[in-house]
């Protein structure tokens, strides 16, 4: 059993490594956004036993603006972007209580712009453990309709070792 | 068509530092969320960390505070710097560029490199 895509959450990106069952995963404030004090990042598969479908737990997190870096012009794309500060540790307690967080999640002094470029062909290299899947692109509509500001891309099988509407990590596409 | 070539391994001493480059050619690399992974012989890979494209980044708790990761994105390039190197550093390093479901949610791809090699020895 595992989960579907965890949701979209304003202003934070996450980078899921495991779609199993309790897998924790992190989500983090964009650069110039911080997390808010008393709000949660984390987010945990689990099973719901009465439908015994696998969903992810929803975060708290609020992303606001660091007012440390309003007054800060965003840097042209040409620079170089990094971050040094991680975020503050976090606990996925039954009780629900998290420790506050006042620093960011990434003390990102520049913010890179990219246009994204829809309907481009990507075309796998071999992977280090699997090796070759070939896949396509395409944009998807997962998201809610205030999120569909950006155009996403989304994993397809396509002759390959791995059946239609399985994506990496065991994440299978059922709902 | 995407396609990612790692550099910058090598032998290094304990406490050293590298910095490992990840090319990206092909529609899409500049707005990708890309991660470093490593992998050694016999054993699982392991995630690194993450830049997505904000600039903001995320890492593994062994490597918080060592690893650093920029882009730059002019030269379609991802960067792993690499500092206070440890002999269980040792790996090959690869970088991936994810594939995004949602909104701001992203995971590991079919898009590899070929990977560099980290050795850290005395």
């Known amino acids: 059993i595992t989960c579907p895509p965890p949701m979209s959450v304003e202003h934070a990106d996450i980078w899921v490594k495991s779609y199993s069952l309790y897998s924790r995963e992190r989500y983090i404030c964009n650069s110039g956004f911080k997390r808010k004090a008393g709000t949660s990042s984390l987010t945990e598969c689990v099973l719901n036993k009465a439908t015994n479908v696998a969903h992810w737990t929803t975060p708290s997190l609020k992303c606001i603006r660091d007012p440390a870096l309003v007054h800060q012009r965003p840097a042209p794309p040409s620079t170089v972007t990094t971050a040094g500060v991680t975020p503050q540790p976090e606990s996925l307690s039954p009780s629900g209580k998290e420790p506050a967080a006042s620093s960011p999640s990434s003390n990102n002094t520049a913010a890179t712009t990219a246009a994204i470029v829809p309907g481009s062909q990507l075309m796998p290299s071999k992977s280090p453990s699997t090796g070759t899947t070939e896949i396509s692109s395409h944009e998807s509509s997962h998201g809610t309709p205030s999120q569909t500001t950006a155009k996403n891309w989304e994993l397809t099988a396509s002759a390959s070792h791995q059946p239609p509407g399985v994506y990496p990590q065991g994440h299978s596409d059922t709902t | 068509e995407v396609q990612l070539v790692e550099s910058g391994g090598g032998l290094v001493q304990p406490g050293g530092s590298l910095r490992l480059s990840c090319v990206g050619s092909g529609d899409g690399f500049s707005i990708s969320a890309v991660a470093w992974y490593r992998q050694t012989p016999g054993k699982q890979r392991e995630w690194v960390g993450v830049i997505f494209s904000s600039g903001s980044t995320d890492y593994a708790d062994s490597v918080k505070g060592r690893f650093t990761i920029s882009r730059d994105n002019a030269k379609n390039t991802v960067y792993l710097q690499m500092n206070s190197l440890k002999p269980e550093d040792t790996a090959v390093y690869y970088c991936?560029?994810?594939?995004?479901?949602?909104?701001?949610?992203?995971?590991?791809?079919?898009?590899w490199g070929q990977g560099t090699q980290v050795t850290v020895s005395s």
């Open positions: 991936n560029a994810g594939v995004t479901t949602n909104r701001g949610v992203h995971h590991e791809s079919n898009y």
